[in-house]
């Protein structure tokens, strides 16, 4: 039969630079001598030789002078390859080779890496920062292998996605350089992080700028929003209240107003320089123009999603600056629950009956509560599931497993928490023996 | 370091039209504005423009609004300022100069002369 | 549109000079205010920004003040580089608006 080769299953990788060991061993039959063995290294999708053993001689290598064999471990099966200053043109698999009487091959994947370097950050511009300014942070990472990915987040660590772009080029030597811009709406104040990951040593290099922008010695803007969260029916219209106090002889071209996502910073609608700059969310969304002069800032969303959920954040800069961050509440109200009864006919009492009740399309989670006919609650063996649709709207499912007694009603209520709103169905089962629906 | 070069000197006919370039270098091109300023001799200087390398977003001194048109090249780093319909009170020189509120570099300038 | 008023519209120093250049604005434009300096056949230099705050690079003799609608440029010790026009701009509004420029003379 074939001559058993084995090598590891697992790329090995290594560092550009190092050396790196392609384990590769065979069982020798007793009194075998390495006269007998013939032992080739190659590269596998091109057969390129690369280093050979042969009529009891290390036939040197084939590969830059680069590569060589454990002649004192060959008689013991070890037929690894050593590969010296790796380079990222060595990546890819190798097939060792061996024939004795018999032969036998397998292949070997080499991974080639190097360490990114910490990333160095630049931001432009890099002074008479205000509010409301758009800069451009560059987070440059050098001499790594492979392509990197590279992550930028908030102070708070809230991934940044929006309007990142990254590039990468490799040198001579098939390294890359990793550049990767991050353009951001300046708040108050904000650091920034970058980070460079190197997928195969799962190395992470990261570095952050803090950007304090320039303040007034006037002092800030008091913005103010409502407290409590604003709740808005989905598919219908919200507006997000936010106003300021505008000083005489305050004019629009001096107002920087933006609206972002509170955690995210995504830009939401901005308002510079005496121009409505528009919806950047959508375009759903919109200002008042109108009221903009005597200090209202305040945002209409238009047909309201369960995705829009969550934290504004209203940023108001005139001389100085101010914000403030107002809460999102989605809601929508559950349908009249539908029932369904199981078994529905030739019920006697003592038997187990399920009770299904469902209701449709509401948000948030409902919060589902079963009684009898003297309104005393059943909580015993209810089983109550939620599931959200595409659009985050819930269809809720409440099964309650009851033994029939004479008769009774059963009464389930769904209640929507946001808007208080309570919707309820109720089954009556009487008779005996009875049938159910009752017929007519 | 931070540079940029504008087009050689233009000599026009009035009624015709010009075209300023402005080639930055040494920076990240789509993270300044660019602006236009206009210095006639012997007079104030006065704001043309400016654009947002980054989406093109135009802002025009009113003044300016039908007489100057600015674009951009990203993939060269280019910044444009057409004039058109020239008469001779165009003649001056034009610089590119970007930031926001300040300045900080400006091209050397380039000198149109209109005359028939 | 804020109008810009620089006064004197020249004026003759000699070397060592203490020399002062004022803006006024025609509006409240806090401390949004930028001083350039311009030779001849050369494109203007940014000296102060923020009212009173030294570009990198630019010599401490330089100094701005003021906040409101009222600013001044100080050249603490003339030196013979300093013979040039000077011109405010606000950058509180658009359009942004020069002042017509000091030329600084030897006297």
């Known amino acids: 039969g074939a001559l058993e080769v084995q090598v590891p299953e697992d790329p090995v990788v290594a560092l550009v630079g190092t050396d790196a060991t392609l384990c590769c061993s065979f069982s020798p039959e007793p009194g075998f001598s390495l006269a007998q063995l013939n032992l080739i290294w190659q590269l596998t999708d091109t057969k390129q030789l690369v280093h050979s053993f042969a009529e009891g001689q290390d036939q040197g290598s084939a590969y830059a002078n680069r590569t060589a064999l454990f002649p004192d471990l060959l008689a013991q099966g070890n037929a690894s390859l050593r590969l010296q200053r790796v380079r990222v043109a060595d990546e890819g698999s190798f097939t060792c080779f061996v024939s004795i009487r018999d032969f036998g091959s397998a292949a070997v994947s080499l991974q080639v890496a190097a360490p990114y370097s910490k990333p160095s950050m630049t931001l432009e511009p890099n002074k008479d920062l205000r509010p409301g300014d758009t800069v451009t942070i560059t987070c440059s990472s050098y001499q790594g292998y492979p392509e990197a990915e590279v992550f930028w987040q908030d102070g708070q660590g809230v991934p940044l996605t929006g309007n990142v772009t990254t590039s990468q080029m490799a040198n001579e030597q098939g390294l890359f350089d990793v550049h990767s811009i991050l353009r951001v709406v300046l708040g108050a104040n904000g650091t920034y992080s970058c980070l460079v990951r190197n997928p195969v040593l799962q190395q992470d290099a990261h570095s952050s700028v803090t950007i304090t922008p320039q303040r007034s010695p006037t002092g800030a803007v008091e913005v103010q929003v409502p407290e409590d969260p604003v709740v808005a029916l989905v598919g219908t219209d919200a507006t997000l209240r936010c106003s300021f106090s505008p000083e005489p002889g305050f004019s629009l071209a001096q107002l920087n107003l933006i609206w972002q996502l509170t955690d995210t910073k995504q830009l939401v609608h901005s308002f510079t320089e005496g121009r409505d700059q528009g919806s950047a969310y959508a375009n759903r969304t919109a200002l008042f123009p109108d009221l903009l002069a005597q200090g209202n800032a305040s945002l209409r969303l238009q047909r309201v999603r369960v995705a829009d959920e969550g934290s504004f954040t209203c940023f108001v800069s005139i001389r100085d600056f101010g914000s403030a961050a107002v809460s999102l509440q989605v809601a929508a109200p559950y349908s009249k629950p539908s029932m369904t009864l199981e078994p529905n006919k030739d019920l006697r009492p003592g038997d187990t009956v399920t009770i299904t009740c469902s209701s449709y399309r509401g948000y948030p989670e409902a919060e589902v509560f079963w009684q009898d006919g003297q309104g005393v609650p059943l909580t015993g063996n209810v089983t109550t599931s939620q599931m959200a649709n595409e659009q985050g709207l819930f269809d809720v499912h409440s099964v309650l497993r009851v033994v029939l007694g004479a008769n009774g009603t059963y009464s389930c209520l769904v209640r929507n928490p946001v808007l208080q709103q309570d919707a309820h169905g109720s089954v009556t089962i009487t008779g005996q023996p009875m049938t159910f629906p009752p017929e007519a | 370091e931070v540079q940029l070069v504008q087009s050689g000197a233009e000599v026009k006919k009035p009624g015709s039209s010009v075209k300023v370039s402005c080639k930055a270098s040494g920076y990240t091109f789509t993270a300044y504005w660019m602006n236009w300023v206009k210095q006639r001799p012997g007079q104030c200087l006065e704001w043309i423009g400016r654009?947002?390398?980054?989406?093109?977003?135009?802002r025009y001194n009113q003044n300016f609004r039908d007489k100057a048109r600015l674009t951009v090249d990203k993939s060269s780093s280019t910044a444009y300022m057409e004039l058109s319909s020239l008469r001779s009170e165009d003649t001056a020189v034009y610089y590119c100069?970007?930031?926001?509120?300040?300045?900080?570099?400006w091209g050397q300038g380039t000198t149109v002369t209109v005359s028939s | 549109d804020i109008q810009m008023t620089q006064s004197p519209s020249s004026l003759s120093a000699s070397v060592g000079d203490r020399v002062t250049i004022t803006c006024r604005t025609s509006?409240?434009?806090?401390?949004?205010l930028a001083w350039y300096q311009q030779k001849p056949g050369k494109s203007p230099k940014l000296l102060i920004y923020?009212?009173?705050t030294l570009e990198e690079g630019v010599p401490s003799r330089f100094r701005g003040s003021g906040s409101g609608t009222h600013f001044t440029l100080t050249i603490s010790s003339l030196q013979p580089e300093d013979f040039a026009t000077y011109f405010c701009?606000?950058?509180?509004?658009?359009?942004?608006?020069f002042g017509c420029g000091t030329k600084v003379e030897i006297k």
């Open positions: 701009k606000q950058a509180y509004d658009v359009p942004r608006t």
């Open positions: 100069a970007r930031g926001v509120r300040i300045f900080d570099y």
């Open positions: 654009i947002d390398p980054y989406d093109s977003e135009t």
């Open positions: 509006e409240n434009i806090d401390y949004t």
């Open positions: 923020n009212a009173n």
